[in-house]
């Protein structure tokens, strides 16, 4: 009898009520492997979730987040609020990055600017809330007599940028 069930393909289940005939999965359910005794209910993309891929008889639905949110967790099990570049999400909502930190994405945390001097380099372009500093040649490379192919870009005031 077990052999009869193993013949049931994905998208069907082995129906014990009908002499182990392979019956199609009912609507809103699926079986992704053969030989299943039941079909699983499809995941429901509801509320903050929107459907990225419809459920089929052989594969589960896949969800995404509505506009203004991005996925977190395995298989997009949660949606986290987006912030603007130059901000990070706290428990109380989006907050601007503190001076000396930046975030160039709509998600994640503010990270410290690169410390150019650790690599023996100098700051070519100052950092902002949205962008890391740009490191340039080392101070020694900029000493009189050293050639530079491109002059340094004018530095913006640190920590300030248009909102």
């Amino acid at each position: 009898l077990q052999d009869l069930c193993s013949n049931c393909p994905a998208g069907t289940f082995c129906d014990n009520n009908r002499s182990q005939i392979c019956s199609p999965c009912p609507p809103n359910s699926f079986s992704s492997a053969g030989g299943q005794r039941t079909c699983d209910i499809c995941r429901q993309c509801k509320g903050v979730f929107k459907t990225r891929k419809e459920c089929s008889s052989t594969s589960n639905a896949e969800c995404d987040c509505i506009s203004g949110y991005h996925c977190l967790g395995a298989e997009c099990s949660m949606c986290e609020q987006d912030c603007k570049q130059g901000q990070e999400l706290t428990k109380k909502g989006c907050k601007d990055c503190c001076f000396g930190t930046f975030n160039d994405q709509k998600r994640g945390i503010c990270r410290p600017w690169t410390n150019c001097s650790l690599d023996g380099k100098s700051v070519l372009v100052n950092g902002t809330k949205e962008r890391d500093v740009v490191c340039g040649p080392s101070p020694a490379d900029l000493s009189p007599g050293a050639s530079s192919a491109t002059p340094p870009a004018p530095a913006r005031e640190p920590g300030h940028s248009p909102q």
Partner: antibody, heavy 123, light 106 residues
Framework: EVQLVESGGGLVQPGGSLRLSCAAS??????????VGWIRQAPGKCLEWLAL???????YYSPSLKSRLTISRDNSKNTLYLQLNSLRAEDTAVYYC???????????????WGQGTLVTVSS | DIQLTQSPSSLSASVGDRVTITCRAS??????LAWYQQKPGKAPKLLIY???NLETGVPSRFSGSGSGTDFTLTISSLQPEDFATYYC????????FGCGTKVEIK
Amino acid sequence: EVQLVESGGGLVQPGGSLRLSCAASGFSLSTGGVGVGWIRQAPGKCLEWLALIDWADDKYYSPSLKSRLTISRDNSKNTLYLQLNSLRAEDTAVYYCARGGSDTVIGDWFAYWGQGTLVTVSS
Amino acid sequence: DIQLTQSPSSLSASVGDRVTITCRASQSIGSYLAWYQQKPGKAPKLLIYDASNLETGVPSRFSGSGSGTDFTLTISSLQPEDFATYYCQQGYYLWTFGCGTKVEIK
């Protein structure tokens, strides 16, 4: 601060109807991503999810009670409603209003609950 | 519908004990599981969401684990204020609650 305050409970005759209200404050019922629902608990029994409405006005109902339930909201009053018809003794319970998700991370759980309102169905 | 079965339905424990409560789903629900604590006459309080994430303000002695069909809530060292009833809840398809586990004083 998020607050949910239920009202409308009391003694109802079998076969009658009831309309419960849930006044929300600290957030808007129409904010993208927000869902608010009703959950009940009969005396000494389990929690039972009844219905939920989301910001886009999509409504979800418990299959076993769908024919007797109507969930709605009034955005201008920031208030949620639940209508339950053809009341029976087994509908006697505390009815809770609850908001889906937490503050910045939203999913299919309930982080905020009202204090509940008691509905007694008896003749 | 998706059913959730909690075990045990009740347990007796002492302050300082490690307590484990399980919740089994009738089919795979990924990590779409939350845990709540409820005290008599009060509304449930969210403890854990997405199977293992601790809600803000909940003590770190509470932890959740599991995915698919089997989930666990653990209280590492039971405190006097932890005597209550605990419920699991799934949000994979509609919403369903387990029937609770009452944690009583031994």
